[in-house]
């Protein structure tokens, strides 16, 4: 007959799960902030830099109050997957100038990957509908010049910083509502 069934698996406290996700997001925000500052020190940015392939920022001012957990997690996961892809591209195709940002870029990539896994786990623990697998994204074209790679790095780190700041705000507020 086999061993007797174990005790029913207790579902983890969603607040605790969300809490550890917030902390991981804040930790990644700190890393991104530090790396963006390092990039600015080495290659000062003249104004804002944009990259068309980056996700648009997930929210406008005043929209925080209307946030719902499934929407935040789904959107955050999609945006972070895009940033992960861009960081991988930057490390591969960014040119020799950006080699000076290693090993920090590698660490950032690993921590971004860890946060994505944590979000996936949180979504399954909260029994949220899993998003369909992402369609294969078109490959990112290599930067046209060394300076193009640096401009792309400014855009990627700046965008990631704002996305994570937005995520921390949203997750902190949602945690108080749980």
């Amino acid at each position: 007959p086999g061993p007797p069934p174990g005790p029913p698996r207790v579902s983890p406290d969603p607040r605790a799960e969300l809490d550890s996700t917030v902390l991981l997001t804040r930790s990644l925000l700190a890393d991104t902030r530090q790396l963006a500052a390092q990039l600015r020190d080495k290659f000062p940015a003249d104004g804002d830099h944009n990259l068309d392939s980056l996700p648009t920022l997930a929210m406008s001012a005043g929209a925080l109050g209307a946030l719902q957990l499934p929407g935040v997690l789904t959107r955050l996961r999609a945006d972070l997957l895009s940033y992960l892809r861009h960081v991988q591209w930057l490390r591969r195709a960014g040119g020799s100038s950006l080699k000076t940002l290693e090993p920090e870029l590698g660490t950032l990539q690993a921590r971004l990957d860890r946060l994505l896994r944590r979000l996936q786990l949180l979504m399954s623990r909260l029994a949220l509908p899993q998003p369909p697998p992402d369609p294969p994204a078109p490959p990112l074209a290599p930067p046209s010049s060394a300076w193009g790679g640096i401009r792309a790095a400014h855009a990627i780190l700046g965008g990631l910083h704002l996305t994570l700041d937005w995520a921390v705000r949203g997750l902190l507020l949602l945690k108080t509502r749980l």
């Epitope: 804040r26 929210m59 005043g62 925080l64 700041d165 937005w166």
Partner: antibody, heavy 119, light 111 residues
Framework: EVQLVQSGAEVKKPGASVKISCKAS????????MDWVKQAPGQRLEWIGD????????IYNQKFTGRATLTVDKSASTAYMELSSLRSEDTAVYYC????????????WGQGTTVTVSS | DIVLTQSPASLALSPGERATLSCRAS??????????IHWYQQKPGQAPRLLIY???NLESGVPARFSGSGSGTDFTLTISSLEEEDFATYYC?????????FGQGTKLEIK
Amino acid sequence: EVQLVQSGAEVKKPGASVKISCKASGYIFRDYNMDWVKQAPGQRLEWIGDINPTIGAPIYNQKFTGRATLTVDKSASTAYMELSSLRSEDTAVYYCARGELAHWYFDVWGQGTTVTVSS
Amino acid sequence: DIVLTQSPASLALSPGERATLSCRASKSVSTEGYSYIHWYQQKPGQAPRLLIYLASNLESGVPARFSGSGSGTDFTLTISSLEEEDFATYYCQHSRDLPPTFGQGTKLEIK
């Protein structure tokens, strides 16, 4: 020199509103969030809220939600806090302070704005 | 909300003495490699000034006689040898969660 300069003292009647400004200089305004802190006489410091200059999206201490409104004017590197439906307990010094959400400490403070609520 | 309790409420010491100020949190404020406690100094009529961030990191421009330690729920600010300008009120602040809160302060007075 990194500086936050706040608007001057205000005297208001109960039920009125007050709007305090905080002008930032000496750093890139969009690189840090702006937080607001209340210090009432004989009370501990109390965090009111935080705003990101690029995306707006303020978050508030629940105690102040609905009465405090944080805004920014990026072009003027200035943050604002408006407090409505004033009552005597709102008599305090209000500070703006530079912060960020990763570690959330306040490394640069304004000089403070005294708000007195009295009939 | 996390409540921070500072002790003692006031402390009278002489210049040259060592000061030890305590801050206790109602729940742990340490996690993911960080202790989310920060210390400030405030003098009458002035804004608070950051001294120590993340429990033990000395803010730029702050004299090395200031140091911070602790983890979990118990934290300490130490001033190794008091100078005249150190007599002020000291506050701890946590940033572990929303909302960040402050302790009630420890007033350091000249004996």
